[in-house]
Protein backbone atom coordinates (compact mmCIF):
# COMPACT_ATOMS: atom_id res chain seq x y z
CA UNK A 1 0.00 0.00 0.00
CA UNK A 2 2.96 2.28 0.58
CA UNK A 3 6.28 2.62 -1.15
CA UNK A 4 9.76 1.77 0.04
CA UNK A 5 13.07 3.27 -0.92
CA UNK A 6 16.19 1.12 -0.62
CA UNK A 7 19.70 2.46 -0.09
CA UNK A 8 22.99 1.03 1.18
CA UNK A 9 23.60 1.02 4.92
CA UNK A 10 27.15 2.41 4.80
CA UNK A 11 29.25 4.40 2.32
CA UNK A 12 32.76 5.76 2.78
CA UNK A 13 33.42 9.14 1.17
CA UNK A 14 36.50 9.52 -1.01
CA UNK A 15 39.49 11.51 0.11
CA UNK A 16 38.09 14.38 -1.95
CA UNK A 17 34.90 14.42 0.08
CA UNK A 18 32.68 12.76 -2.51
CA UNK A 19 30.18 10.02 -1.69
CA UNK A 20 27.86 8.16 -4.07
CA UNK A 21 25.10 5.64 -3.58
CA UNK A 22 22.03 4.29 -5.33
CA UNK A 23 18.53 4.95 -4.06
CA UNK A 24 16.01 2.50 -5.51
CA UNK A 25 12.26 2.72 -5.09
CA UNK A 26 9.45 0.33 -5.82
CA UNK A 27 5.80 1.15 -6.32
CA UNK A 28 2.57 -0.12 -7.82
CA UNK A 29 2.16 3.12 -9.76
CA UNK A 30 3.66 4.20 -13.06
CA UNK A 31 5.26 7.53 -12.21
CA UNK A 32 6.32 9.95 -14.93
CA UNK A 33 7.54 12.62 -12.53
CA UNK A 34 9.58 11.82 -9.44
CA UNK A 35 11.03 14.06 -6.74
CA UNK A 36 14.09 12.90 -4.85
CA UNK A 37 15.16 14.62 -1.64
CA UNK A 38 18.32 13.93 0.30
CA UNK A 39 17.90 14.46 4.04
CA UNK A 40 20.61 14.44 6.70
CA UNK A 41 19.66 13.22 10.14
CA UNK A 42 21.61 14.44 13.14
CA UNK A 43 19.99 13.36 16.38
CA UNK A 44 16.29 14.14 16.08
CA UNK A 45 16.94 16.91 13.56
CA UNK A 46 16.37 16.31 9.86
CA UNK A 47 17.73 18.82 7.37
CA UNK A 48 17.35 18.90 3.59
CA UNK A 49 20.66 18.58 1.78
CA UNK A 50 19.29 18.81 -1.75
CA UNK A 51 16.26 17.95 -3.85
CA UNK A 52 15.37 17.48 -7.50
CA UNK A 53 12.34 16.68 -9.62
CA UNK A 54 12.88 14.63 -12.74
CA UNK A 55 10.85 12.94 -15.43
CA UNK A 56 11.63 9.32 -16.11
CA UNK A 57 12.83 10.11 -19.64
CA UNK A 58 15.21 12.85 -18.53
CA UNK A 59 18.42 13.15 -16.58
CA UNK A 60 18.15 14.03 -12.91
CA UNK A 61 18.78 17.76 -12.46
CA UNK A 62 19.68 19.43 -9.20
CA UNK A 63 19.83 23.16 -8.61
CA UNK A 64 23.01 24.83 -9.87
CA UNK A 65 24.26 25.67 -6.40
CA UNK A 66 23.49 22.21 -5.07
CA UNK A 67 26.03 20.00 -3.35
CA UNK A 68 24.42 17.02 -5.10
CA UNK A 69 24.44 15.58 -8.57
CA UNK A 70 22.59 12.57 -9.83
CA UNK A 71 21.53 10.37 -12.68
CA UNK A 72 18.40 8.29 -12.98
CA UNK A 73 17.49 5.07 -14.71
CA UNK A 74 14.01 3.67 -14.27
CA UNK A 75 13.35 3.38 -10.56
CA UNK A 76 17.00 3.82 -9.57
CA UNK A 77 18.68 7.11 -8.76
CA UNK A 78 22.45 7.38 -8.42
CA UNK A 79 23.13 10.21 -5.99
CA UNK A 80 26.47 11.91 -5.43
CA UNK A 81 27.21 14.36 -2.62
CA UNK A 82 30.25 16.58 -2.96
CA UNK A 83 32.22 18.80 -0.62
CA UNK A 84 31.89 16.52 2.38
CA UNK A 85 34.12 17.02 5.41
CA UNK A 86 34.55 15.02 8.60
CA UNK A 87 31.80 17.04 10.28
CA UNK A 88 29.52 15.89 7.44
CA UNK A 89 29.61 12.33 8.72
CA UNK A 90 26.05 11.25 9.39
CA UNK A 91 22.94 9.43 8.26
CA UNK A 92 21.73 10.49 4.82
CA UNK A 93 18.16 9.52 4.01
CA UNK A 94 16.74 9.22 0.53
CA UNK A 95 13.11 10.37 0.20
CA UNK A 96 11.27 9.58 -3.02
CA UNK A 97 7.95 11.13 -4.02
CA UNK A 98 5.91 10.05 -7.04
CA UNK A 99 4.52 13.46 -7.95
CA UNK A 100 2.71 12.85 -11.23
CA UNK A 101 0.50 11.40 -12.56
CA UNK A 102 -1.72 10.62 -9.58
CA UNK A 103 -1.72 8.92 -7.18
CA UNK A 104 0.92 10.62 -5.05
CA UNK A 105 3.15 8.26 -3.12
CA UNK A 106 6.10 8.83 -0.83
CA UNK A 107 8.79 6.49 0.45
CA UNK A 108 11.82 6.93 2.67
CA UNK A 109 14.90 4.80 2.82
CA UNK A 110 16.40 3.65 6.12
CA UNK A 111 19.37 5.92 5.54
CA UNK A 112 22.98 5.58 4.45
CA UNK A 113 25.65 6.25 7.05
CA UNK A 114 28.31 8.25 5.23
CA UNK A 115 31.72 8.32 6.86
CA UNK A 116 33.98 11.21 5.92
CA UNK A 117 37.62 11.24 6.89
CA UNK A 118 39.44 14.49 6.26
CA UNK A 119 42.76 13.83 4.49
CA UNK A 120 45.93 14.42 6.47
CA UNK A 121 47.71 17.59 5.30
CA UNK A 122 50.82 16.82 3.27
CA UNK A 123 54.04 17.28 5.24
CA UNK A 124 56.32 20.09 4.06
CA UNK A 125 59.23 18.79 2.02
CA UNK A 126 62.64 20.42 2.43
Amino acid sequence: KGMHAAQPAVVLASSRGVASFVCEYGSSGNAAEVRVTMLRQAGSQMTEVCAATYTVEDELAFLDDSTCTGTSSGNKVNLTIQGLRAMGTGLYICKVELMYPPPYYVGMGNGTQIYVIDPEPCPDSD
Epitope: K1, G2, M3, A32, R35, A52, Y104, Y105, V106, M108
Partner: antibody, heavy 114, light 110 residues
Framework: EVQLVESGGDLVKPAGSLRLSCVAS????????MNWVRQAPGKGLQWIAG????????SHIDAIKGRFTISRDNAKNTLYLQMNSLRAEDTAVYYC???????WGQGTLVTVSS | QAVLNQPASVSGSLGQRVTISCTGS????????VAWYQQLPGTGPRTLIN???NRASGVPDRFSVSRSGNTATLTISGLQAEDEADYHC???????????FGSGTQLTIL
Protein backbone atom coordinates in the same frame (compact mmCIF):
# COMPACT_ATOMS: atom_id res chain seq x y z
CA GLU B 1 6.64 30.56 4.17
CA VAL B 2 4.72 28.57 1.57
CA GLN B 3 1.63 30.34 0.28
CA LEU B 4 -0.99 29.49 -2.33
CA VAL B 5 -3.47 32.28 -3.07
CA GLU B 6 -6.46 31.64 -5.32
CA SER B 7 -8.46 34.35 -7.07
CA GLY B 8 -10.94 34.78 -9.90
CA GLY B 9 -14.03 33.32 -8.26
CA ASP B 10 -17.26 35.15 -9.01
CA LEU B 11 -21.01 34.88 -9.63
CA VAL B 12 -21.55 33.75 -13.22
CA LYS B 13 -24.55 32.70 -15.27
CA PRO B 14 -24.94 29.12 -16.57
CA ALA B 15 -22.91 28.53 -19.77
CA GLY B 16 -20.60 31.36 -18.73
CA SER B 17 -16.81 31.28 -18.29
CA LEU B 18 -14.27 32.10 -15.58
CA ARG B 19 -10.53 31.78 -15.15
CA LEU B 20 -9.21 30.97 -11.71
CA SER B 21 -5.62 31.74 -10.72
CA CYS B 22 -3.44 30.38 -7.94
CA VAL B 23 -0.29 32.34 -7.20
CA ALA B 24 2.43 30.37 -5.39
CA SER B 25 5.27 31.65 -3.24
CA UNK B 26 7.76 30.32 -0.71
CA UNK B 27 8.76 27.20 -2.67
CA UNK B 28 10.14 26.13 -6.04
CA UNK B 29 6.83 26.17 -7.92
CA UNK B 30 8.32 24.86 -11.17
CA UNK B 31 9.47 21.68 -9.41
CA UNK B 32 6.03 20.58 -8.25
CA UNK B 33 2.99 19.07 -9.90
CA MET B 34 -0.21 20.81 -8.81
CA ASN B 35 -3.91 20.02 -8.27
CA TRP B 36 -7.28 21.74 -8.26
CA VAL B 37 -9.84 20.50 -5.72
CA ARG B 38 -13.37 21.83 -5.20
CA GLN B 39 -15.91 21.73 -2.41
CA ALA B 40 -19.60 22.27 -3.14
CA PRO B 41 -21.64 23.93 -0.36
CA GLY B 42 -22.16 21.47 2.48
CA LYS B 43 -20.38 18.68 0.58
CA GLY B 44 -17.04 16.90 0.71
CA LEU B 45 -13.88 17.67 -1.23
CA GLN B 46 -13.54 16.59 -4.87
CA TRP B 47 -10.27 16.39 -6.81
CA ILE B 48 -10.91 17.70 -10.33
CA ALA B 49 -7.58 18.18 -12.13
CA GLY B 50 -3.81 17.86 -11.91
CA UNK B 51 -0.85 19.07 -13.96
CA UNK B 52 2.81 18.07 -14.00
CA UNK B 53 5.62 20.44 -13.06
CA UNK B 54 6.41 21.50 -16.61
CA UNK B 55 2.80 21.88 -17.70
CA UNK B 56 3.09 19.34 -20.51
CA UNK B 57 0.75 16.73 -19.02
CA UNK B 58 -2.66 17.06 -17.38
CA SER B 59 -5.28 14.77 -15.83
CA HIS B 60 -8.86 15.45 -14.79
CA ILE B 61 -12.19 13.89 -13.85
CA ASP B 62 -14.84 13.12 -16.47
CA ALA B 63 -17.27 15.68 -15.03
CA ILE B 64 -15.14 18.57 -16.32
CA LYS B 65 -13.86 16.98 -19.53
CA GLY B 66 -14.01 19.37 -22.47
CA ARG B 67 -15.14 22.25 -20.24
CA PHE B 68 -12.30 22.98 -17.81
CA THR B 69 -8.61 23.31 -18.64
CA ILE B 70 -5.77 23.27 -16.11
CA SER B 71 -2.56 25.09 -17.07
CA ARG B 72 0.39 26.86 -15.48
CA ASP B 73 2.92 29.62 -16.09
CA ASN B 74 6.09 28.77 -14.19
CA ALA B 75 7.62 32.16 -15.00
CA LYS B 76 4.76 33.77 -13.07
CA ASN B 77 4.53 31.04 -10.39
CA THR B 78 0.86 30.73 -11.27
CA LEU B 79 -1.57 27.84 -11.75
CA TYR B 80 -4.76 28.38 -13.76
CA LEU B 81 -8.16 26.77 -14.21
CA GLN B 82 -10.06 27.92 -17.28
CA MET B 83 -13.74 27.11 -16.74
CA ASN B 84 -16.14 27.17 -19.69
CA SER B 85 -19.76 26.06 -20.14
CA LEU B 86 -20.33 26.43 -16.42
CA ARG B 87 -23.25 24.61 -14.80
CA ALA B 88 -25.10 25.07 -11.51
CA GLU B 89 -23.39 21.93 -10.18
CA ASP B 90 -19.99 23.62 -10.60
CA THR B 91 -20.87 25.97 -7.73
CA ALA B 92 -18.16 25.40 -5.14
CA VAL B 93 -15.09 26.74 -3.40
CA TYR B 94 -12.07 25.91 -5.57
CA TYR B 95 -8.72 25.16 -3.93
CA CYS B 96 -5.28 24.69 -5.43
CA UNK B 97 -2.88 22.29 -3.73
CA UNK B 98 0.61 20.93 -4.25
CA UNK B 99 0.43 17.38 -5.58
CA UNK B 100 1.98 15.98 -2.41
CA UNK B 101 -0.93 17.60 -0.52
CA UNK B 102 1.47 19.38 1.85
CA UNK B 103 -0.05 22.80 1.20
CA TRP B 104 -3.46 24.12 0.13
CA GLY B 105 -4.75 27.57 -0.71
CA GLN B 106 -7.59 29.31 1.13
CA GLY B 107 -10.01 28.86 -1.78
CA THR B 108 -12.06 31.04 -4.12
CA LEU B 109 -15.84 30.81 -4.45
CA VAL B 110 -17.48 30.17 -7.81
CA THR B 111 -21.26 30.56 -7.93
CA VAL B 112 -23.15 29.55 -11.07
CA SER B 113 -26.70 30.86 -11.02
CA SER B 114 -29.14 32.63 -13.29
CA GLN C 1 -19.52 12.90 -5.05
CA ALA C 2 -18.19 11.63 -1.70
CA VAL C 3 -17.10 8.01 -2.09
CA LEU C 4 -15.69 7.44 1.39
CA ASN C 5 -18.17 7.32 4.28
CA GLN C 6 -17.61 9.44 7.38
CA PRO C 7 -19.99 10.29 10.23
CA ALA C 8 -21.50 13.75 9.70
CA SER C 9 -20.53 14.84 13.20
CA VAL C 10 -18.81 13.76 16.39
CA SER C 11 -18.38 15.57 19.67
CA GLY C 12 -16.28 15.40 22.79
CA SER C 13 -15.29 17.33 25.88
CA LEU C 14 -11.97 19.04 26.48
CA GLY C 15 -9.30 16.48 27.32
CA GLN C 16 -11.37 13.57 26.04
CA ARG C 17 -10.58 11.22 23.16
CA VAL C 18 -12.67 10.99 19.98
CA THR C 19 -12.47 8.76 16.91
CA ILE C 20 -13.57 9.50 13.35
CA SER C 21 -14.08 6.59 10.98
CA CYS C 22 -13.64 6.58 7.21
CA THR C 23 -15.06 3.59 5.35
CA GLY C 24 -14.33 2.80 1.75
CA SER C 25 -14.00 -0.31 -0.39
CA UNK C 26 -11.45 -2.83 -1.61
CA UNK C 27 -10.59 -0.56 -4.55
CA UNK C 28 -9.62 2.45 -2.44
CA UNK C 29 -8.84 2.18 1.30
CA UNK C 30 -8.43 -1.59 1.05
CA UNK C 31 -5.81 -1.19 -1.67
CA UNK C 32 -4.32 2.24 -1.16
CA UNK C 33 -3.28 4.77 1.46
CA VAL C 34 -5.48 7.05 3.56
CA ALA C 35 -4.66 10.69 4.27
CA TRP C 36 -6.45 13.01 6.68
CA TYR C 37 -7.11 16.75 6.51
CA GLN C 38 -8.33 19.32 9.02
CA GLN C 39 -10.41 22.26 7.84
CA LEU C 40 -11.04 25.15 10.18
CA PRO C 41 -14.10 27.32 9.42
CA GLY C 42 -13.54 29.58 6.41
CA THR C 43 -10.10 28.21 5.55
CA GLY C 44 -8.57 25.71 3.18
CA PRO C 45 -7.77 22.17 4.31
CA ARG C 46 -4.56 21.43 6.18
CA THR C 47 -2.90 18.04 5.93
CA LEU C 48 -2.82 16.19 9.25
CA ILE C 49 -1.74 12.71 8.19
CA ASN C 50 0.28 12.16 5.03
CA UNK C 51 -0.21 9.28 2.61
CA UNK C 52 2.59 7.35 4.32
CA UNK C 53 0.59 7.39 7.56
CA ASN C 54 2.91 9.85 9.27
CA ARG C 55 1.83 13.12 10.82
CA ALA C 56 2.45 16.20 8.73
CA SER C 57 4.99 18.74 9.95
CA GLY C 58 3.85 20.55 13.07
CA VAL C 59 0.96 18.18 13.83
CA PRO C 60 0.96 17.10 17.51
CA ASP C 61 1.12 13.43 18.44
CA ARG C 62 -2.41 13.69 19.88
CA PHE C 63 -3.48 12.81 16.33
CA SER C 64 -3.02 9.18 15.32
CA VAL C 65 -4.42 6.80 12.70
CA SER C 66 -5.17 3.14 12.30
CA ARG C 67 -6.68 0.97 9.61
CA SER C 68 -8.52 -2.32 9.47
CA GLY C 69 -9.64 -3.71 6.14
CA ASN C 70 -11.56 -1.02 4.27
CA THR C 71 -11.92 1.29 7.25
CA ALA C 72 -9.47 3.91 8.52
CA THR C 73 -9.79 5.68 11.85
CA LEU C 74 -8.46 9.02 13.03
CA THR C 75 -8.06 9.29 16.81
CA ILE C 76 -7.68 12.63 18.55
CA SER C 77 -6.71 12.33 22.20
CA GLY C 78 -6.61 15.10 24.77
CA LEU C 79 -9.12 17.25 22.87
CA GLN C 80 -8.36 20.95 22.76
CA ALA C 81 -10.59 23.88 21.80
CA GLU C 82 -8.61 24.49 18.60
CA ASP C 83 -9.45 20.97 17.38
CA GLU C 84 -13.01 22.08 16.60
CA ALA C 85 -13.08 21.76 12.81
CA ASP C 86 -14.13 19.57 9.90
CA TYR C 87 -12.05 16.46 9.22
CA HIS C 88 -11.76 14.82 5.80
CA CYS C 89 -10.20 11.53 4.73
CA UNK C 90 -8.97 10.70 1.25
CA UNK C 91 -7.59 7.80 -0.73
CA UNK C 92 -6.90 6.78 -4.32
CA UNK C 93 -9.48 4.65 -6.08
CA UNK C 94 -7.80 2.17 -8.42
CA UNK C 95 -11.10 1.43 -10.19
CA UNK C 96 -12.20 5.02 -10.76
CA UNK C 97 -8.60 6.22 -11.22
CA UNK C 98 -9.22 9.32 -9.16
CA UNK C 99 -8.67 10.68 -5.68
CA UNK C 100 -11.68 10.05 -3.49
CA PHE C 101 -12.65 11.95 -0.36
CA GLY C 102 -15.04 11.50 2.50
CA SER C 103 -18.00 13.78 3.05
CA GLY C 104 -16.29 15.34 6.07
CA THR C 105 -16.92 15.06 9.80
CA GLN C 106 -17.65 18.09 11.96
CA LEU C 107 -15.98 17.85 15.36
CA THR C 108 -17.66 19.85 18.11
CA ILE C 109 -16.00 20.48 21.45
CA LEU C 110 -18.56 20.41 24.25
Amino acid sequence: EVQLVESGGDLVKPAGSLRLSCVASGFSFSSYAMNWVRQAPGKGLQWIAGINSGGSSTSHIDAIKGRFTISRDNAKNTLYLQMNSLRAEDTAVYYCAISNWAYWGQGTLVTVSS
Amino acid sequence: QAVLNQPASVSGSLGQRVTISCTGSSSDIGKSYVAWYQQLPGTGPRTLINVDGNRASGVPDRFSVSRSGNTATLTISGLQAEDEADYHCSSWDWSLHTYVFGSGTQLTIL
